[in-house]
C-alpha cells in the first residue's frame, strides 16, 4: 500500500490507477476507515449521505473535501480499462494536525541550586497524532532521570475534535556553581515524520545559590561552643563543593594531628580543650579554604555560656569521624 499523509480539514484526492479518464468506467472504491464498519463500497454513481465525506470524481479519483481523523485507514480502488485489464490501487491514509506553537506556562523565574525545582510546564494544544514534547537546556536535549532532571507528562484528548493536548512539567536540580542564567526551551515533535519540530520561546531563570559556593561552614553543637566540664562538643565542617574535599582541623592556628574528617568530636571536655577551632577544606581544584573560627570554652556551674556564633577554639581528647 502507498502511504499518504493528509492534514486534517484539507481536501484529499486519491487516484484510481488504470481507470478510463471519463465514463463509462468500471471501477469501485473500497474503504476501511474509522467511518466504516469493515469495508464500505463506493461507486461512480454515488449519491446519498456519503457524498459529503467522499465521492468518486468523473475521472475515477476519490475526493474527500475535508479529511478528518475518522478517515484514517485503507482505501482501495479496483478498475478495469477498455481492454478488460484490471488495475488495483491501494492507499494507507494517515491524517495529522500541527498544533499551535507550544508554550511554557507557569514558569519559575528563580531556581535554587542543589535542590529540585519546578522550571515550568510546556503545553502543546491541538496535535494529531499526539506527538511528543522534549526539553532543552542551552540548546541541548535534557534526558529525563539523568543528572537531576525529571519530567511529568500528561496527554489529554479533546472529546469532540479528537485532537491532543500535551503537558510536560520539568523539574531540575541545578548544579552548585553552575550557570547563573540557564536557558530552557521546549519543543514539540510531530508523531508523523517529515514535519519539523516546533520550539517555544526560551526562558532564562536566575539560579540562586542558597549555600555559599566558596565558604566552608563550621557548625558547633552545642550552639555557641560553651559546655560544662566533662561534656561533649561536636564540630561539623560543611562544604558544598563536589567532590567532597579533604577536611583537616586547626586549634589556635595549629594543625591537629588527626586523619582527615568532616566531623570532630571533643568528648569529656577539659581545660586543655579550650581554644579556637577551625577546619580547612582542601580541594584538588582550588587549594585550601579555612572556615570561620569558633571558640570552645568551659562553663563553670552557674555561669552563662557565650552567645551563639562567638569566635574561639578546642583541645585534644578528640575523635575524627569519616
Amino acid at each position: 500500500a502507498q502511504n499518504i499523509t493528509a492534514r486534517i480539514g484539507e481536501p484529499l484526492v486519491l487516484k484510481c490507477k488504470g481507470a478510463p479518464k471519463k465514463p463509462p468506467q468500471r471501477l469501485e472504491w473500497k474503504l476501511n476507515t474509522g467511518r466504516t464498519e469493515a469495508w464500505k463500497v463506493l461507486s461512480p454513481q454515488g449519491g446519498g449521505p456519503w457524498d459529503s465525506v467522499a465521492r468518486v470524481l468523473p475521472n475515477g479519483s476519490l475526493f474527500l473535501p475535508a479529511v478528518g481523523i475518522q478517515d484514517e485507514g485503507i482505501f482501495r480502488c479496483q478498475a478495469m480499462n477498455r481492454n478488460g485489464k484490471e488495475t488495483k490501487s491501494n492507499y494507507r491514509v494517515r491524517v495529522y494536525q500541527i498544533p499551535g506553537k507550544p508554550e511554557i506556562v507557569d514558569s519559575a523565574s528563580e531556581l535554587t541550586a542543589g535542590v529540585p525545582n519546578k522550571v515550568g510546564t510546556c503545553v502543546s494544544e491541538g496535535s494529531y497524532p499526539a506527538g511528543t514534547l522534549s526539553w532543552h537546556l542551552d540548546g541541548k536535549p535534557l534526558v529525563p532521570n539523568e543528572k537531576g532532571v525529571s519530567v511529568k507528562e500528561q496527554t489529554r484528548r479533546h472529546p469532540e475534535t479528537g485532537l491532543f493536548t500535551l503537558q510536560s512539567e520539568l523539574m531540575v536540580t541545578p548544579a552548585r556553581g553552575g550557570d547563573p542564567r540557564p536557558t530552557f526551551s521546549c519543543s514539540f515533535s510531530p508523531g508523523l515524520p517529515r514535519h519539523r519540530a516546533l520550539r517555544t520561546a526560551p526562558i532564562q531563570p536566575r539560579v540562586w545559590e542558597p549555600v555559599p559556593l566558596e565558604e566552608v561552614q563550621l557548625v558547633v553543637e552545642p550552639e555557641g561552643g560553651a559546655v560544662a566540664p566533662g561534656g561533649t562538643v561536636t564540630l561539623t565542617c560543611e562544604v558544598p563543593a563536589q567532590p567532597s574535599p579533604q577536611i583537616h582541623w586547626m586549634k589556635d592556628g595549629v594543625p591537629l594531628p588527626l586523619p582527615p574528617s568532616p566531623v570532630l568530636i571533643l568528648p569529656e571536655i577539659g581545660p586543655q580543650d579550650q581554644g579556637t577551632y577551625s577546619c580547612v577544606a582542601t580541594h584538588s581544584s582550588h587549594g585550601p579554604q579555612e572556615s570561620r573560627a569558633v571558640s570552645i570554652s568551659i562553663i563553670e556551674p552557674g555561669e552563662e555560656g557565650p552567645t551563639a556564633g562567638s569566635v574561639g577554639g578546642s583541645g585534644l581528647g578528640t575523635l575524627a569521624l569519616a
Epitope: D106, A108, S109, E110, V115, P116, W208, V211, L213, E215
Partner: antibody
C-alpha cells in the same frame, strides 16, 4: 568571613536623589547576585531588585522600576542603589543581601522637608 | 505578583513549646518558599529555603514543610532567643514576595 558594609543614615529632601553603597568582602563579589530589600518602619520586607556584578545583569520589581537603579563596581567590590524623585514613602531601612544568605546592617533613609 | 499570606500577626508561646507558623501562597509556587528570622534591631536571617532545606548552621529545632500553596514553619522547642518576627518568602517567581510577618512573643 563574608561581610556586607552599608553606608550610614541618610536624610534627604522630597524630590532629591540618593545613592547608597554596600561594600562586600570575604567572597568573590562577581559570583553572586546582590539583592536589595526595603523595610518601612514597623512593616514587612519588599524586594526591590538584584544585580549580578559579574556582568551587571539586573532585574527589578516592576514597582521599583524608575525609582531604583542598581549598579556595581567590581574593582572595589561595591554595589550601589540610587533612589530618585524621593517622597515620604521612600523613608525606610534598605538592606543589601548577597544571595539572601548574608545581609548588610541596613541603611536608614529619612525623607523630610 | 504572588501574594504570601501569614494569617497570624502575633503568636505567643512559652520556652520549650512547639510552635508552627503558617503561610499561604496565592498560586502554586511548588516548593520555592524560604523562611527568615528578624530579631529586633537586626537584619533578617535566612533559616529555611526550598520549603524544607535548613540553611547552613541553622539549629535543627527549626524545620519547614509544605508545597503548592500551603507552607508551615515549625520551632520544635522554643528558646528565649527565638523571640523575633518570622517571614515567609516565595522564590518561585519575580518579584520575590514576602508574607507580612509573624511576631513570636515569649510568655
Amino acid at each position: 568571613e563574608v561581610q556586607l558594609q552599608q553606608s550610614g543614615t541618610v536624610l534627604a529632601r522630597p524630590g532629591a536623589s540618593v545613592k547608597m553603597s554596600c561594600k562586600a568582602s570575604g567572597y568573590t563579589f562577581t559570583s553572586y547576585w546582590m539583592h536589595w530589600v526595603k523595610q518601612r518602619p514597623g512593616q514587612g520586607l519588599e524586594w526591590i531588585g538584584a544585580i549580578y556584578p559579574g556582568d551587571s545583569d539586573t532585574y527589578y520589581n516592576q514597582k521599583f522600576k524608575g525609582k531604583a537603579k542598581l549598579t556595581a563596581v567590581t574593582s572595589t567590590s561595591t554595589a550601589y542603589m540610587e533612589l530618585s524623585s524621593l517622597t515620604n514613602e521612600d523613608s525606610a531601612v534598605y538592606y543589601c543581601t548577597r544571595n539572601w544568605d548574608y545581609w548588610g546592617q541596613g541603611t536608614t533613609l529619612t525623607v523630610s522637608s | 505578583d504572588i501574594v504570601m499570606t501569614q494569617s497570624h500577626k502575633f503568636m505567643s508561646t512559652s520556652v520549650g513549646d512547639r510552635v508552627s507558623i503558617t503561610c499561604k501562597a496565592s498560586q502554586d509556587v511548588s516548593t520555592a518558599v524560604a523562611w527568615y528570622q528578624q530579631k529586633p534591631g537586626q537584619s533578617p536571617k535566612l533559616l529555611i529555603y526550598s520549603a524544607s532545606y535548613r540553611y547552613t548552621g541553622v539549629p535543627d529545632r527549626f524545620t519547614g514543610s509544605g508545597s503548592g500553596t500551603d507552607f508551615t514553619f515549625t520551632i520544635s522547642s522554643v528558646q528565649a532567643e527565638d523571640l523575633a518576627v518570622y517571614y515567609c518568602q516565595q522564590h518561585y517567581n519575580t518579584p520575590r514576595t514576602f508574607g507580612g510577618g509573624t511576631k513570636l512573643e515569649i510568655k
